[in-house]
Amino acid sequence: SQVSQNCHNGSYEISVLMMGNSAFAEPLKNLEDAVNEGLEIVRGRLQNAGLNVTVNATFMYSDGLIHNSGDCRSSTCEGLDLLRKISNAQRMGCVLIGPSCTYSTFQMYLDTELSYPMISAGSFGLSCDYKETLTRLMSPARKLMYFLVNFWKTNDLPFKTYSWSTSYVYKNGTETEDCFWYLNALEASVSYFSHELGFKVVLRQDKEFQDILMDHNRKSNVIIMCGGPEFLYKLKGDRAVAEDIVIILVDLFNDQYFEDNVTAPDYMKNVLVLTLSPGNSLLNSSFSRNLSPTKRDFALAYLNGILLFGHMLKIFLENGENITTPKFAHAFRNLTFEGYDGPVTLDDWGDVDSTMVLLYTSVDTKKYKVLLTYDTHVNKTYPVDMSPTFTWKNSKLPNDITGRGPQ
């Protein structure tokens, strides 16, 4: 049903869904702090632009009685229940921030007449791609997939002279929300990744993974998995690994690899870690004091969601345009705005662009070193270390199929 929006006459409200089921187990208080910090910045920016308006946030909490799994499994109904609550209260803002779970975002988008923009910190799955009024401020699965295909095909780097066309994907069903959808995208038979690879098999059992490490008859030397180093260690332990195995560990929202005192454990020597470039330190900000490094990206996405709204509000007000229009709802894409941590770029479909960083463990220093960067906005790789001190033979990445000659 059509809900009137609190979004005119100099008063602009943001509806923030505070869902019990979330992509990251973050206390709602921390997200509230992030939103409030964002509001302060937006008010300052609007004031500096000579726009004398009021911007507030309304936090919509679910009762948590029915949907209490805490993860995203029961988020579909929770999202719709919250929308019903908004509808009953006749209290909708200019923009909806949240939800973060792919299930709930997909369902809410499907089941509502979306004449307002929706900003999500999460919604990683392919089912949330190409949604006209949805903006995603954390790297979605599509971006990961494009990197992997680009990297697989690359054969003109000093350290990667073979194109790859095969892979194993380890996916045991216990993954975090981001990893679940990243791996889900790689598994999907109709996805770009599957389409571009000649061979791909999903390993679902620990034993399957462990057996592949030394299996002479394996069909690929490359294994993709998602999680942190500890996750890998639980699985791999100190088992021997064939010398031409390459494990790609996707761990996007973890900037601990860049900390000065971090030493790579020995079991990481056959591993390339894919992560995001580290942001400027957020440690001094009031909202992030209680956050672990892996949670900062989530809270930061909420904060940046507020700043994005402020950016669009400023543009529309300066141009004398109405906020409660489809034009406003569809405008949150193909732009760069001033985020909390520097410029943030959104692609044509409202998805955040970022710099992914591929790290390796130096056999000399036992430190994580940057091998290359990948700009998701232009789909281009930039090699950083041309002479990496790899564990692999000749300091080059092996072929993906043992015994196959140059491609």
Epitope: D156, P158, S277, P278, T336, G342, P343, T345, T355, V357, V370, T373, Y374, D375, H377, V378, K380, Y382, P383, V384, M386, S387
Partner: antibody, heavy 118, light 110 residues
Framework: EVQLVQPGAEVKKPGSSVKVSCKAS????????ISWVRQAPGQGLEWMGR????????NYAQKFQGRVTITADKSTSTAYMELSSLRSEDTAVYFC???????????WGQGTLVTVSS | QSELTQPASVSGSPGQSITISCTGT?????????VSWYQQHPGKVPKLMIH???HRPSGVSNRFSGSRSGNTASLTISGLQAEDEADYFC??????????FGTGTKVTVL
Amino acid sequence: EVQLVQPGAEVKKPGSSVKVSCKASGGTLSSYAISWVRQAPGQGLEWMGRIIPILGITNYAQKFQGRVTITADKSTSTAYMELSSLRSEDTAVYFCARDQRPASMDVWGQGTLVTVSS
Amino acid sequence: QSELTQPASVSGSPGQSITISCTGTSSDVGGYIYVSWYQQHPGKVPKLMIHDVSHRPSGVSNRFSGSRSGNTASLTISGLQAEDEADYFCSSYTSSNNYVFGTGTKVTVL
């Protein structure tokens, strides 16, 4: 399309330092490198060093090691090149340029003429 | 290696083809695909003409082509035109994780 904007000119005394800025407008510094290249009057191009702003990783030409410092501010999309202990031979146009691939500079700033004179 | 070696000048008549060489070592030109060519008109900013030995950026005329043999890279300009008169510089990535430019070649259209 990104453009690199540099100040027009600087006049410095021998022994002093100069800090030249290079701001990306119409885009961000992104994940590429920013190189600094100088050209003395009537001379060829000379590579001084580079930075990958998103990571803060720098490399310097041996000739300038210890005398040049390249930095970047991601939040303002600005790169900086500081050259110390200036001498008259440092009089040159200083360009910043974006590396879209290593040693492949596809976007250049207009250049800053630094004159070192007593 | 402080600089890559280029001929000081090359000339040709309109419509002709000319080739500029750029000689280095196996630690730079011969060792990596990262060899580029730049055109610079007097008082202007250098313009990227070729990257990765032989790749032309969009917007660059297909009269410009690049190649490499051993430690020498070459830039060929076919169908020489008056506006091609400029200085040309090669550059390469080096094994010391640096870049190096060539000495520069002045192209004159007769």
